[in-house]
């Protein structure tokens, strides 16, 4: 699942340290016991530089062979490389391995530009910075692929999140995340707080530079700030979600909802971009382009290619909008919205440019598969996966990128009727589900 | 069709204040189309971008210029321009306005532009 | 920064020849890359933007090619009035700031 503006993503560290996070209001939700509080051990256990992807390390096979492994709730294969490969520091060697289990079969996963291919089998995996527990779960061993991994990314394989329904090469593939609920007490949930750079990172910084958390099991109060709003899981296959408003600025976009989620809106912390369907995109832009007019930019900076700089220091956040999208609600006829700042869809860009200057990439870009709720979005919210409640939390990420006159929000509730009309009924075919790079 | 014209002293002190004007005619400085630029040449040397200003006033510098450099505009007169301050012998030129369009990034239109010597 | 490199720094040629021009960027510009011509005592004028697209009024003989890092412009057939330098400017980072340092086209 990994493409164009797909894979790579970004990460970096800013915002306060952990003595620093803003006290969280109470919370008005109930939880189930044992689903919340401290996981510190998980705390910042994810890293990544610029635009390359957010990565956990992990453990594989016996004697235990250490992996770094990009997070990616937009696909649902773990999948590590298995063999020499140019960008490649290491890689998984299955002959060394005495509980590798091979399942005698192959996968190949193509891409709008790329692809992966390899053998499917079984060994002991762990994640060292996560909970005590080792399950034996499927492992894609890739042993050819073309334009997957990255140069420097410093990456050498990706956990698949999502559910079995987009696994490869069918839904019997166990994803690793049922295996480790199935084999353990964790609880089945998992929480995302990945910390953008927010200014160009020089390359000791963005090597140095840590990214984020991935809390297994649960949720850490420490990572967000307020409460948290769920929306629900519209259907297990991606983290599926239904949009039912646009805002840029506060200005209403006016399109039919249906178009915000044509032909689905994901969560997906894989993709770097705020991606959205060809018609919001031109309307979104239109809108952002009105709203920051003061000050033109290139057409190819629209298009998310050409860089714009400023002297370091000087980037006005003030005059670009933000950025909301009202989610459905868990109650009937009502919804909450996640609101973002330039700070999160202006991406810096590290090493372009002299010292003297900070430049950015647009971060919110064209989609021929509907919305995808990339890093751009997940960037400035702690995201909680509770598939336990087959729902998505969001709140206020205590390490989001900010400026002192705006911040990122969640807040609710709305009246927002007929939400169900929303979403986007894709024509059930053979080959539904079967492009699975995002263009 | 438009054509752009640059002012000014052809001898400047130095430390003193290089001051250049551009006059557009037959089209308007207020176009959205366009960005307005300033690009100096130092004799047998190569093009050094200075800055650009966007009519609304918006303005971006040479980051190595930029404590120097003072682009403003006028649109009533149809004219932006160009004030560099603390000049040395260093900043003798051929200084050359020009229109930054094809989506505000390149060069398509420029003036004849007018030397500038810096000397007591 | 990037840095624009353009080589020869000097390319002698009779008219009719065939000029084929180079500019390397340190790092990609992607196709945002730009070609002027400039004769002496003139204000530069732009010929190619976007790598390969001819500026309004351009000759067919003037052609650019290449993307990221490598960039050539050709001119098919050289006229007497070709004779002139040529400087690529990259605009991948914008403002538009950098151009290189310029080939010389001169009559052999």
């Known amino acids: 699942t990994h493409l164009g503006i797909r894979l790579p993503l970004r990460s970096g560290l800013a915002g306060p340290p952990l003595g620093l996070r803003l006290p969280r209001e109470t919370d008005e939700e109930s939880e189930e016991p044992g689903r919340r509080g401290s996981f510190v051990e998980m705390v910042d256990n994810l890293r990544g530089k610029s635009g390359q992807g957010y990565y956990v390390e992990m453990t594989v096979g016996s004697p235990p062979q250490t992996l770094n492994i990009l997070v990616d709730t937009g696909s649902s294969n773990f999948a590590v490389g298995a063999a020499p490969h140019p960008f490649l520091h290491r890689y998984y060697q299955r002959q060394l391995s005495s509980t590798y289990r091979d399942l005698r079969k192959g996968v190949y996963v193509p891409y709008t530009q790329g692809k992966w291919e390899g053998e499917l089998g079984t060994d002991l995996v762990s994640i060292p910075h996560g909970p005590n527990v080792t399950v034996r779960a499927n492992i894609a061993a890739i042993t050819e692929s073309d334009k997957f991994f990255i140069n420097g990314s410093n990456w050498e394989g990706i956990l698949g999140l999502a559910y079995a329904e987009i696994a490869r090469p069918d839904d019997s593939l166990e994803p690793f995340f049922d295996s480790l609920v199935k084999q353990t007490h964790i609880p089945n949930i998992f929480s995302l707080q990945l910390c953008g750079a927010g200014f160009p990172l020089n390359q000791t910084e963005a090597l140095a530079s840590v990214g984020g958390s991935m809390i297994i099991g649960g949720i850490d109060h420490s990572l967000y700030t307020g409460r948290l709003w769920y929306t629900p899981i519209r259907r297990e296959w991606y983290y599926e979600v239904i949009i039912v408003r646009v805002e840029i600025n506060g200005q209403d976009l006016k399109m039919d909802c249906k178009e915000y989620n044509y032909d689905k809106s994901i969560v997906d912390s894989g993709t770097t971009n705020l991606r959205l369907p060809k018609k919001v995109f031109e309307a979104a832009v239109k809108s952002i382009k009105a709203a920051s007019s003061t000050e033109k930019f290139p057409d190819g900076f629209w298009l998310g290619e050409q860089l714009v700089c400023w002297q370091a220091g000087t980037t006005p956040w003030n005059i670009f909008p933000v950025i909301s999208l009202y989610l459905m609600g868990e109650v009937t006829n009502q919804s909450f919205r996640i609101t973002i700042l330039p700070q999160q869809y202006l991406r810096p860009v590290e090493d372009v440019a002299t010292s003297q200057d900070d430049c950015y990439k647009f971060a919110v870009s064209q989609s021929s598969t509907g919305t995808v709720m990339g890093a751009v979005i997940m960037e400035g919210f702690y995201v909680v996966f509770d598939r336990a409640r087959k729902r998505i939390g969001f709140a206020v990420s205590a390490c989001h990128v900010h400026d002192e006159f705006r911040t990122a929000a969640v807040e609710g509730p709305f009246v927002t009727a007929d939400m169900e009309d929303c979403g986007y009924n894709i024509p059930q075919t053979d080959e539904s589900t079967l492009m699975t790079g995002r263009a | 069709q438009l054509q752009l014209q640059e002012s000014g002293p052809g001898l400047v002190k130095p430390s003193e204040t290089l001051s250049l004007t551009c006059t557009v005619s037959g089209g308007s400085i207020s176009s959205s189309s366009y960005y307005w630029g300033w690009i100096r040449q130092p004799p047998g040397k190569g093009l050094e971008w200075i800055g650009n200003?966007?009519?609304?006033?918006?303005?971006y510098y040479n980051p190595s210029l930029k404590s120097r450099v003072t682009i403003s505009v006028d649109t009533s007169k149809n004219q932006f321009s160009l004030k560099l301050s603390s000049v040395t012998a260093a900043d003798t030129a051929v200084y050359y306005c020009?229109?930054?369009?094809?989506?505000?990034?390149?060069?398509?239109?420029w003036g004849r532009g007018t030397l500038v010597t810096v000397s007591s | 920064e990037i840095v624009l490199t353009q080589s020869p720094a000097t390319l002698s040629l009779s008219p009719g020849e065939r000029a084929t021009l180079s500019c390397r960027a340190s790092q990609s510009v992607s196709s945002y890359l730009a070609w002027y011509q400039q004769k002496p005592g003139q204000a530069p004028r732009l010929l190619i933007y976007d790598a390969s697209n001819r500026a309004t009024g351009i000759p067919a003989r003037f052609s650019g090619s290449g993307s990221g890092t490598d960039f050539t412009l050709t001119i098919s057939s050289l006229e007497p009035e070709d004779f002139a330098v040529y400087y690529c400017q990259q605009v991948y980072l914008w403002p538009p700031r950098t151009f290189g340092g310029g080939t010389k086209v001169e009559i052999k």
């Open positions: 020009a229109r930054l369009g094809h989506g505000y990034s390149y060069f398509d239109l």
């Open positions: 200003i966007y009519y609304s006033g918006s303005t």
